[in-house]
């Protein structure tokens, strides 16, 4: 039952992200930023199951990429970062297996390229912000909160996926 497995993985990832905080976020209030989280892309009502999975996959892939950089390694406690990356990697594998399974069941799987592009642009804005802020501790703290927000939002998409099972 992939949606169930993924939901548990998502919860574990959220807990790890929560534990990764290194500085008080209240010292970073002035650094907060609107990254334009594409909330409509996490509304499962508008997608086929394969489309929803591909949006989740893109979000997790981009998160994995973001936290796999050298700058990220310098920003976070190593063991937590490794656990977080491992959790994301496992989720990506699960989702890929699920896509293969679903494609075999659906007549004509539609690609939702606009949604995937929206997620990519969202992460580009996050990367640009980090670059502009010179990967400061506060910049990373703001990004950590933002990623937690996007993961929470993706939970809604997973709930809808589960209802479609």
């Amino acid at each position: 039952d992939l949606p169930q497995t993924h939901s548990l993985g998502n919860r574990r990832a959220l807990i790890l992200l929560a534990q990764m905080g290194r500085i008080s976020p209240f010292s970073c209030l002035k650094d907060r930023h609107d990254f334009g989280l594409p909330q409509e892309e996490f509304d499962g009502n508008q997608f086929q199951k394969t489309q929803a999975i591909s949006v989740l996959h893109e979000m997790i892939q981009q998160t994995f990429n973001l936290f796999s950089t050298e700058d990220s390694s310098a920003a976070w406690e190593q063991s937590l970062l490794e656990k977080f990356s491992t959790e994301l990697y496992q989720q990506l594998n699960n989702l890929e297996a699920c896509v293969i399974q679903e494609v075999g069941m659906e007549e004509t799987p539609l690609m939702n390229e606009d949604s995937i592009l929206a997620v990519r642009k969202y992460f580009q804005r996050i990367t640009l912000y980090l670059t502009e802020k010179k990967y400061s501790p506060c910049a990373w703290e703001v990004v950590r909160a933002e990623i937690m927000r996007s993961f929470s939002l993706s939970t809604n998409l997973q709930k809808r996926l589960r209802r479609k099972d």
Epitope: A18, R32, H33
Partner: antibody
Framework: QVQLQESGTVLARPGASVKMSCKAS????????MHWVKQRPGQGLEWIGV????????TYNQKFKDKAKLTAVTSANTAYMELSSLTNEDSAVYFC?????????????WGQGTTVTVSS | DIVLTQSPASLAVSLGQRATISCRAS??????????MHWYQQKPGQTPKLLIY???NLESGVPARFSGSGSGTDFTLNIHPVEEEDAATYYC?????????FGSGTKLEIK
Amino acid sequence: QVQLQESGTVLARPGASVKMSCKASGYSFTTYWMHWVKQRPGQGLEWIGVIYPGNGDTTYNQKFKDKAKLTAVTSANTAYMELSSLTNEDSAVYFCTRNYKYDYYTMDYWGQGTTVTVSS
Amino acid sequence: DIVLTQSPASLAVSLGQRATISCRASKSVSTSGHSYMHWYQQKPGQTPKLLIYLASNLESGVPARFSGSGSGTDFTLNIHPVEEEDAATYYCQHSGELPFTFGSGTKLEIK
């Protein structure tokens, strides 16, 4: 479902200290900041401070820095607030409230409130 | 500290009409695309309930007759059409900087 259960009414003498509790259930207690808010009878709301139960990190409204002390015991899923050197001005209802939407710092779930009455 | 001034202190609105509540901050609470102003409803003997976050985002489960607008220092909560159950005190709260503060409240009475 998320619930915040606060301790009951407290009657205290001026100069004394009181410690109230807020037991959380229905969510991961260690991963959400917990705010404390004061409301005097017939008056508005005042933000006292916030604690992160996961590591005990606290941030206070300077006005309450020497008045309130926030703590949490993760094994009991309970947050505490101790008020010291009580005066009549401390007579109020005190709410614990869960932080919401990460760094937007809004408050979604609220305890039912602990009423503190300071009287000689 | 940022002072939030709510007006009016109280208002009476007929059933089905529009209620407009204003909240003015002594300093901007907006930064990089977000306005850190939120609205709560508190009914007598109850705890506050979040209605609107980030100036204009409706909290899940809150009726669409509630709406928020504004940026910088001037914010508005609108309720239209007003219903009997909307009788309550409404508070704005900012999270733009420390300490977070609340407005003094606006008591809404339904005529």
